[in-house]
Amino acid sequence: RRDVAHGILNEAYRKVLDQLSAGKHLQSLVARGVGGSLGGGAGDDAEPLSKRHSDGIFTDSYSRYRKQMAVKKYLAAVLGKRYKQRVKNKGRR
């Protein structure tokens, strides 16, 4: 049973480490300004980020990622004529 308990603890610990690692990666992305300036948004020259800002980091990084993906699809369609990549979610709004 002790082995099982250790296994469970190790798995939980690994998950925490993964989350911390992901958080650090996102911090580095934000610090380096990955996602660019398209669409404006908050400045990229912010001070090192605290736990208090973690929700904001994830939201901001995801928002930047979405913008980047959207503009990539747009460029593929309008400058690359790759119409299969066109956004066609007409019914959404």
């Epitope: 747009y74 369609a77 690359g80 956004v87």
Partner: antibody
Framework: EVQLVESGGGLVQPGGSLRLSCAAS????????MTWVRQAPGKGLEWIGF???????YYASWAKGRFTISRDNSKNTVYLQMNSLRAEDTAVYFC??????WGQGTLVTVSS | DIVLTQSPSTLSASVGDRVTITCQSS???????LAWFQQKPGKAPKFLIY???KLESGVPSRFSGSGSGTEFTLTISSLQPDDFATYYC??????????FGGGTKVEIK
């Protein structure tokens, strides 16, 4: 005939607002990216931003905050709302379906 | 952000001449998504070439594009009277969307 027609341009005072329209005839705009581009008198082309089929808009960093692109699929029309206008916003404003079909442009003059 | 620099800014040529316009990018153009447009005074731009070298439907075959990365060219193999206009390159920039070059005016010599 397939065409885009911009309207809504004119003379506006600095600090004022204007809404430009881009109406399509002979084509359903709903599944296309729609782009706004402007051209100051005697100058080159400047990309403003685009709106996708779902209604999400993306802008050049200089345009974010003052300019808003929207669309009304039921009217087959796209809009460019411009606020806090400045003299340097004086230009011909073009809308384009993707970037291969363009309207004739509408002139916006910002002057007191 | 990408800056596209076209050269020359003005080009004087005669009917029948072979004309080459260069578009240089400050950094690699995303996906090689570079297009060329033709614009005449008081008119909207006309789409000529996409993805650096692919001819838009209906555009005469005397127009051709080449290049990749940061160096692109538009060539008109034999200039026709209808070709006197201003030409713009436009490149994909995932930070800023689309960047336009400053334009090249092709005028009659």
């Amino acid at each position: 005939e397939v065409q885009l027609v911009e309207s809504g341009g004119g003379l506006v005072q600095p600090g004022g607002s204007l809404r430009l329209s881009c109406a399509a005839s002979g084509i359903d705009l709903n599944s296309y990216y729609m782009t706004w581009v402007r051209q100051a008198p005697g100058k080159g082309l400047e990309w403003i931003g685009f709106i996708d089929a779902g209604g999400d808009a993306y802008y050049a960093s200089w345009a974010k905050g003052r300019f808003t692109i929207s669309r009304d699929n039921s009217k087959n029309t796209v809009y460019l709302q411009m606020n806090s206008l400045r003299a340097e916003d004086t230009a011909v404003y073009f809308c384009a379906r993707d970037l291969d079909l363009w309207g004739q442009g509408t002139l916006v003059t910002v002057s007191s | 952000d990408i800056v596209l620099t076209q050269s020359p800014s003005t080009l004087s040529a005669s009917v029948g001449d072979r004309v080459t316009i260069t578009c240089q990018s400050s950094e690699s153009v995303y996906g090689n998504y570079l297009a060329w447009f033709q614009q005449k005074p008081g008119k909207a731009p006309k789409f000529l070439i996409y993805e650096a070298s692919k001819l838009e439907s209906g555009v005469p075959s005397r127009f051709s594009g080449s290049g990749s990365g940061t160096e692109f060219t538009l060539t008109i193999s034999s200039l026709q009277p209808d070709d006197f206009a201003t030409y713009y390159c436009a490149g994909g920039d995932i930070s800023e969307g689309v960047a336009f070059g400053g334009g090249t005016k092709v005028e009659i010599k």
